[in-house]
Interface confidence: medium
């Protein structure tokens, strides 16, 4: 049983890694917008037991214009970027806690990397822009990612985490 494509959210895109049951994904606000405090970008593929049909839960996400970007003049084509914003913290893991930062050379570091999933794609809804494009800005100090992304990219990976030592098929890790 799999979910259909998730619903669209105004001024946001979603990077779907898996359409399978219980998959958790997140929407990301487009460039120039940020997640409104108190709203959640998370959605989950769940089963309606009455109908035996899978569907995505409705996110409460509201993407609002980022006032920090309103008065910015456009950058020249060779350096198309968007100013970074720091959103309100939002939990991406079921426990509500993010994995602790670790040394890149540690085993845990490599294992967490393996959350990268083969076949995950960024689907452009328009042709990619030239110059350097901001896809999403920095995470807050709480350790959660910003909800901004370049307008022409639809993200398709989840915020799931792999335990140390678990490597998805299709990737190798060399340390």
């Amino acid at each position: 049983i799999t979910c259909p494509p998730p619903m669209s959210v105004e001024h946001a895109d979603i990077w779907v890694k898996s359409y399978s049951l219980y998959s958790r994904e997140r929407y990301i606000c487009n460039s120039g917008f940020k997640r409104k405090a108190g709203t959640s970008s998370l959605t989950e593929c769940v089963l309606n037991k009455a109908t035996n049909v899978a569907h995505w839960t409705t996110p409460s996400l509201k993407c609002i214009r980022d006032p920090a970007l309103v008065h910015q003049r456009p950058a020249p084509p060779s350096t198309v970027t968007t100013a970074g914003v720091t959103p309100q913290p939002e939990s991406l893991s079921p426990s509500g806690k993010e994995p602790a930062a670790s040394s890149p050379s540690s085993n845990n570091t490599a294992a967490t990397t393996a959350a990268i999933v083969p076949g995950s794609q960024l689907m452009p809804s328009k042709s990619p822009s030239t110059g350097t494009t901001e896809i999403s800005s920095h995470e807050s100090s709480h350790g959660t990612p910003s909800q901004t992304t370049a307008k022409n990219w639809e993200l398709t990976a989840s915020a799931s985490h792999q335990p140390p030592g678990v490597y998805p098929q299709g990737h190798s890790d060399t340390t």
Partner: nanobody, 123 residues
Framework: EVQLVESGGGSVQPGGSLTLSCAAS????????MNWVRQAPGKGLEWVSR????????IYTDSVKGRFTISRNNAKNALYLQMNSLKPEDTAVYYC????????????????RGQGTQVTVSS
């Protein structure tokens, strides 16, 4: 401001080799993991490879494993992708992309990409 400029693309016959370079500026390059992603004609953007901020850890998508090698030179703020045994299916625009998170591996979020360099593999 962050700038990523790729170079080294071109046309090559199947079995050939190319080395892509990415010149980074505007951020503390040595603190960030870096990625190569690619977009084949008419397809979505596909993640190819990632390297840790200190260069000690690398990871590849299955289709390029054993053929591509990602590396970096933090002193030069440069990222590289050595591509050997190229196949027609490697034809794509290749982008270098900066990872979102400082000094940690987590999913494959990245926040900036360059303008890309075209790689064409054809006989």
């Amino acid at each position: 401001e962050v700038q990523l400029v790729e170079s080294g693309g071109g046309s090559v016959q199947p079995g050939g080799s190319l080395t892509l370079s990415c010149a980074a500026s505007g951020f503390a390059f040595s603190l960030y993991h870096m990625n190569w992603v690619r977009q084949a004609p008419g397809k979505g953007l596909e993640w190819v490879s990632r390297i840790s901020n200190d260069g000690t850890s690398t990871i590849y998508t299955d289709s390029v494993k054993g053929r591509f090698t990602i590396s970096r030179n933090n002193a030069k703020n440069a990222l590289y992708l050595q591509m050997n045994s190229l196949k027609p299916e490697d034809t794509a625009v290749y982008y270098c992309a900066k990872s979102t998170y400082d000094s940690r591996w987590r999913d494959h979020d990245y926040d900036y990409r360059g303008q890309g360099t075209q790689v064409t593999v054809s006989s």
